[in-house]
């Protein structure tokens, strides 16, 4: 595929015009997400608002300039981020003796990018350089894609419900995914 | 032995609503994510959704968002699908299912079954 | 969402027949392709799951082989009571989609 999509750290993110980018997870007032009809964005219909947990695979727009060592992007170009999680809690508490273990009920998916597209940018660089034409990859859509435990060995997938046994050694995860007992999420769309 | 039952047949007017219950059995119900799959008549299968009973989470497919509504009773293990602003292409049996899983190969399949509820939409 | 395109569509057999339903999916699906069997009135039952994994009690002349794209289910010698529908399902990416179905009748 040959593209490279220039991004670093000085890297311009601007929402796009009309587009309201939400912060990640971690940042999100978990009060302010409602019921699965609104699909997990800000409420604008007057449904039930629920604490929520997780979101939806979102394709969120943003417009940043891309960068190149000291070159610029002539104008912004716009992409999408896939943001958010797939569904429902699929880890379960599993209290054994006082630790407390997590183990799936069913398997795990990440929104990840689907496809992507190709867009030539014009870099325009100080001192009077010559202006340089890139090739960049940007995501054109997202999917919920399945993740095995075997991708990542940090994901606590090495026993089911059908096979539940401890793990010695193992720590459950950061901020997991678990589904509490009293614990609402929000209801996802895929 | 594993079981699903799920309640009998509807029969609905177009613009009405359904609630389809499954009463699970010898298993404990807590531990796997209930999914709603259906079949319309002399059609594929079609996955409708599943909910986590733990915490009333659900995620839906696409196709049915803002119709839908999934919800489980953890004291009588009952998963319940509502389907609303019916149409006759809603005509179908609904099906609930229960994941299987393969440590081995890390893997999930839909294992155990309801028998199935028909709901026909008819004005 | 991945489109699983099975065919035939149906098929005319007789007991003894070897006989092969391929399934394609619209990209990559890995392994996680699962194959059900479901008679006239009845529930799906699950036959194989990872392409080629055999449930329990399912015998043995099912059988499926494939990754990637395209994937095979064969029955290496068909029984009386393996007249049936069969579906081809992919676990790889939400939604969870299915194949058409392949009804295999008798000849």
């Known amino acids: 595929q040959g593209w490279q999509a220039f991004k670093n750290d000085a890297t311009e993110i601007i929402p796009e015009l009309g587009e309201y980018p939400e912060p990640p997870p971690e940042l999100e007032n978990n009060k302010t997400m409602n019921r699965a009809e609104n699909g997990g964005r800000p409420p604008h219909h007057p449904f039930e608002t629920k604490d929520v947990s997780e979101y939806s695979c979102r394709e969120l727009h943003f417009t940043r300039y891309v960068t190149d060592g000291q070159c610029r992007s002539a104008k912004p170009v716009t992409e999408l981020v896939c943001s958010g999680q797939c569904g429902p809690a699929r880890l379960l508490p599993n209290a054994i003796g006082r630790g407390k273990w997590w183990r799936p009920s069913g398997p795990d998916f990440r929104c990840i990018p689907d496809r992507y597209r190709a867009q030539r940018v014009q870099l325009l660089c100080p001192g009077g350089a010559a202006p340089r034409a890139r090739k960049v990859r940007l995501v054109a859509s997202c999917k919920c894609k399945r993740l095995t435990r075997f991708h990542n060995q940090s994901e606590l997938k090495d026993f089911g419900p059908e096979a539940a046994r401890p793990q010695k050694g193992r720590k459950p995860r950061p901020r997991a995914r678990g589904a509490k007992a009293n614990q609402a999420e929000l209801e996802n769309a895929y | 032995e594993v079981q699903l039952v799920q309640s009998g047949a509807e029969v609905k007017k177009p613009g009405a609503s359904v609630k389809v219950s499954c009463k699970a059995s010898g298993y404990t119900f807590t531990d796997y994510n209930m999914h709603w799959v259906r079949q319309a008549p002399g059609q594929g299968l079609e996955w409708m959704g599943e909910?986590?009973?733990?915490?009333?989470?659900?995620g839906y497919n696409q196709k049915f968002k803002g119709r839908v509504t999934m919800t489980t009773d953890t004291s009588t293990s009952t998963a319940y699908m509502e389907l609303r602003s019916l149409r006759s292409d809603d005509t179908a049996v609904y099906y609930c299912?229960?994941?299987?899983?393969?440590?081995?190969?890390?893997?999930?399949?839909?294992?155990?079954w309801g028998q199935g509820t028909t709901v026909t939409v008819s004005s | 969402d991945i489109q699983m395109t099975q065919s035939p569509s149906s098929l005319s057999a007789s007991v003894g027949d070897r006989v092969t339903i391929t399934c394609r999916a619209s990209q990559d699906i890995s392994n996680y392709l699962n194959w059900y069997q479901q008679k006239p009135g009845k529930a799906p039952k699950l036959l194989i799951y990872h392409t080629s994994r055999l449930l329990s009690g399912v015998p043995s002349r099912f059988s499926g082989s494939g990754s990637g794209t395209d994937f095979t289910l064969t029955i290496s010698s068909l029984q009386p009571e393996d007249f049936a529908t069969y579906y081809c399902?992919?676990?790889?990416?939400?939604?969870?989609?299915f194949g058409g179905g392949t009804k295999v009748e008798i000849k």
């Open positions: 909910i986590n009973p733990n915490s009333g989470g659900a």
């Open positions: 299912a229960r994941l299987g899983y393969d440590d081995i190969y890390d893997d999930w399949y839909f294992h155990v």
């Open positions: 399902q992919q676990g790889d990416t939400l939604p969870y989609t």
